[in-house]
């Protein structure tokens, strides 16, 4: 028995930051989970893991140098991720893993969410091209 | 006027807990994320902790995850550093400071610090 | 992690005299960068955020500048009040890192 998760096809995070709501056919209340954001078509870069164990707080940590936050709802979580760079932009697929109480579950792949990173724009004249944003 | 004030450290053996306090005042301490920094002669300043404005997210450097937990009361005004299962390399002095436009920012305002000393 | 490396690691000067602090990082942190200024026995003290952008308070004689991998904290006119170490501090990515420190002593 597979969690199903629902995402946005597409967001585009104006201001380097973005917030990405993963919807599960699952309610999170009272379980300990492991939600993780992974970034790529192959998920080979795990941006961002939200951990829930009963208590009240959510611990969230990345590995990758991601600055992320998460908000838990019932049967979501959202992440929210900052200070994102133009060639971040990429497919990002969410994750769910149950581990208590059993039996453990995990989510079908779902079809993942384009974050499209778009640069601040500015205005420099043609003759003084401004620095550009990585 | 913003105003960060920490307390509750001290010298404890290893293995040994502690909680710092952090009272704030001069501002809406509700918005705002909170963080720790600790800071050594060694390794100079090194980020610890961090938790969102209700206090329903935290994170932490991997060097003290499992054994440190951060909270707030945002009633009080006052964030809370539990450490337990203290190491010598925790000997530190201690600081809260406040993110700048409430998450991942830069620290706007820092408190005076508490010692830890982890001895034997 | 980002690692920050900051030189020179001291500079001594006399009052009057301008100060030039580098800080340079691993990989770029676009401008992402704070400079902070500690005196002995207080708390670190934001100077400038966002590479350039000078805090609430701060004299005009500090002013940063860079962006990428490459940054520097100017003082124009070192004042007796302005020796102190100064630290820079990324936020690009996480976790949160800080440079080793230049300390600005009176020649």
């Known amino acids: 028995n597979k969690i199903l998760v629902k995402q946005s096809p597409m967001l585009v995070a104006y201001d380097n930051a973005v917030n990405l709501s993963c919807k599960y056919s699952y309610n999170l209340f009272s379980r300990e989970f492991r939600a993780s954001l992974h970034k790529g078509l192959d998920s080979a870069v795990e941006v961002c893991v939200v951990y829930g164990n009963y208590s009240q707080q959510l611990q969230v940590y990345s590995k990758t140098g991601f600055n992320c936050d998460g908000k838990l709802g019932n049967e979501s979580v959202t992440f929210y991720l900052q200070n994102l760079y133009v060639n971040q932009t990429d497919i990002y697929f969410c994750k769910i893993e149950v581990m208590y109480p059993p039996p453990y579950l995990d989510n079908e792949k779902s079809n993942g969410t384009i974050i499209h990173v778009k640069g601040k724009h500015l205005c420099p004249s043609p003759l003084f091209p401004g620095p550009s944003k990585p | 006027e913003v105003q960060l004030v920490e307390s509750g450290g001290g010298l404890v053996q290893p293995g040994g807990s502690l909680r710092l306090s952090c009272a704030a005042s001069?501002?809406?301490?509700?918005?705002?994320?909170m963080h720790w920094v600790r800071q050594t002669p060694g390794k100079g300043l090194v980020w610890v902790s961090r938790?969102?404005?209700?206090?329903?997210?935290?994170s932490f450097a991997d060097s003290v995850r499992g054994r440190f937990t951060i909270s707030r009361d945002n009633a009080k005004n006052t964030l809370y550093l539990y450490m337990n299962s203290l190491r010598a390399e925790d000997t530190a002095i201690y600081y809260c400071?406040?993110?700048?436009?409430?998450?991942?920012?830069?620290?706007?305002?820092w408190g005076q610090g508490t010692l830890v000393t982890v001895s034997s | 992690e980002i690692v920050l490396t900051q030189s020179p690691a001291t500079l001594s000067l006399s009052p009057g005299e301008g100060a030039t602090l580098s800080c340079r990082a691993s990989?770029?942190?676009?401008?992402?960068l704070a400079w902070f200024q500690q005196k002995r026995g207080q708390a670190p003290r934001l100077l400038i955020y966002d590479a350039s952008n000078r805090a609430t308070g701060i004299p005009a004689r500090f002013s940063g500048s860079g962006s990428g991998t490459d940054f520097t904290l100017t003082i124009s006119s070192l004042e007796p009040e302005d020796f102190a170490v100064y630290y820079c501090?990324?936020?690009?990515?996480?976790?949160?890192?800080f440079g080793q420190g230049t300390k600005v002593e009176i020649k």
């Open positions: 501090q990324q936020r690009s990515n996480w976790p949160p890192t």
């Open positions: 990989q770029s942190v676009s401008s992402y």
């Open positions: 938790i969102n404005s209700d206090g329903s997210s935290a």
């Open positions: 001069g501002f809406t301490f509700s918005t705002y994320w």
């Open positions: 400071a406040r993110a700048d436009s409430s998450t991942w920012s830069h620290f706007d305002y």
